[in-house]
């Protein structure tokens, strides 16, 4: 007959799960902030830099109050997957100038990957509908010049910083509502 069934698996406290996700997001925000500052020190940015392939920022001012957990997690996961892809591209195709940002870029990539896994786990623990697998994204074209790679790095780190700041705000507020 086999061993007797174990005790029913207790579902983890969603607040605790969300809490550890917030902390991981804040930790990644700190890393991104530090790396963006390092990039600015080495290659000062003249104004804002944009990259068309980056996700648009997930929210406008005043929209925080209307946030719902499934929407935040789904959107955050999609945006972070895009940033992960861009960081991988930057490390591969960014040119020799950006080699000076290693090993920090590698660490950032690993921590971004860890946060994505944590979000996936949180979504399954909260029994949220899993998003369909992402369609294969078109490959990112290599930067046209060394300076193009640096401009792309400014855009990627700046965008990631704002996305994570937005995520921390949203997750902190949602945690108080749980």
């Amino acid at each position: 007959p086999g061993p007797p069934p174990g005790p029913p698996r207790v579902s983890p406290d969603p607040r605790a799960e969300l809490d550890s996700t917030v902390l991981l997001t804040r930790s990644l925000l700190a890393d991104t902030r530090q790396l963006a500052a390092q990039l600015r020190d080495k290659f000062p940015a003249d104004g804002d830099h944009n990259l068309d392939s980056l996700p648009t920022l997930a929210m406008s001012a005043g929209a925080l109050g209307a946030l719902q957990l499934p929407g935040v997690l789904t959107r955050l996961r999609a945006d972070l997957l895009s940033y992960l892809r861009h960081v991988q591209w930057l490390r591969r195709a960014g040119g020799s100038s950006l080699k000076t940002l290693e090993p920090e870029l590698g660490t950032l990539q690993a921590r971004l990957d860890r946060l994505l896994r944590r979000l996936q786990l949180l979504m399954s623990r909260l029994a949220l509908p899993q998003p369909p697998p992402d369609p294969p994204a078109p490959p990112l074209a290599p930067p046209s010049s060394a300076w193009g790679g640096i401009r792309a790095a400014h855009a990627i780190l700046g965008g990631l910083h704002l996305t994570l700041d937005w995520a921390v705000r949203g997750l902190l507020l949602l945690k108080t509502r749980l």
Partner: antibody, heavy 119, light 111 residues
């Protein structure tokens, strides 16, 4: 020199509103969030809220939600806090302070704005 | 909300003495490699000034006689040898969660 300069003292009647400004200089305004802190006489410091200059999206201490409104004017590197439906307990010094959400400490403070609520 | 309790409420010491100020949190404020406690100094009529961030990191421009330690729920600010300008009120602040809160302060007075 990194500086936050706040608007001057205000005297208001109960039920009125007050709007305090905080002008930032000496750093890139969009690189840090702006937080607001209340210090009432004989009370501990109390965090009111935080705003990101690029995306707006303020978050508030629940105690102040609905009465405090944080805004920014990026072009003027200035943050604002408006407090409505004033009552005597709102008599305090209000500070703006530079912060960020990763570690959330306040490394640069304004000089403070005294708000007195009295009939 | 996390409540921070500072002790003692006031402390009278002489210049040259060592000061030890305590801050206790109602729940742990340490996690993911960080202790989310920060210390400030405030003098009458002035804004608070950051001294120590993340429990033990000395803010730029702050004299090395200031140091911070602790983890979990118990934290300490130490001033190794008091100078005249150190007599002020000291506050701890946590940033572990929303909302960040402050302790009630420890007033350091000249004996």
């Amino acid at each position: 020199e990194v500086q936050l300069v706040q608007s001057g003292a205000e005297v208001k009647k109960p039920g009125a509103s007050v709007k305090i400004s905080c002008k930032a200089s000496g750093y890139i305004f969009r690189d840090y969030n702006m937080d607001w802190v209340k210090q009432a006489p004989g009370q501990r410091l109390e965090w009111i809220g935080d705003i990101n200059p690029t995306i707006g999206a303020p978050i508030y201490n629940q105690k102040f939600t609905g009465r405090a409104t944080l805004t920014v004017d990026k072009s003027a590197s200035t943050a604002y806090m408006e407090l409505s439906s004033l009552r005597s307990e709102d008599t305090a010094v209000y500070y703006c302070a530079r912060g960020e959400l990763a570690h959330w400490y306040f490394d640069v403070w304004g000089q403070g704005t005294t708000v007195t609520v009295s009939s | 909300d996390i409540v921070l309790t500072q002790s003692p409420a006031s402390l009278a010491l002489s210049p040259g003495e060592r000061a030890t100020l305590s801050c206790r949190a109602s729940k742990s404020v340490s996690t993911e490699g960080y202790s989310y406690i920060h210390w400030y100094q405030q003098k009458p009529g002035q804004a608070p000034r950051l001294l120590i961030y993340l429990a033990s990191n000395l803010e730029s421009g702050v004299p090395a006689r200031f140091s911070g330690s602790g983890s979990g729920t118990d934290f300490t600010l130490t001033i190794s040898s008091l100078e005249e300008e150190d007599f002020a009120t000291y506050y701890c602040q946590h940033s572990r969660d929303l909302p960040p809160t402050f302790g009630q302060g420890t007033k350091l007075e000249i004996k």
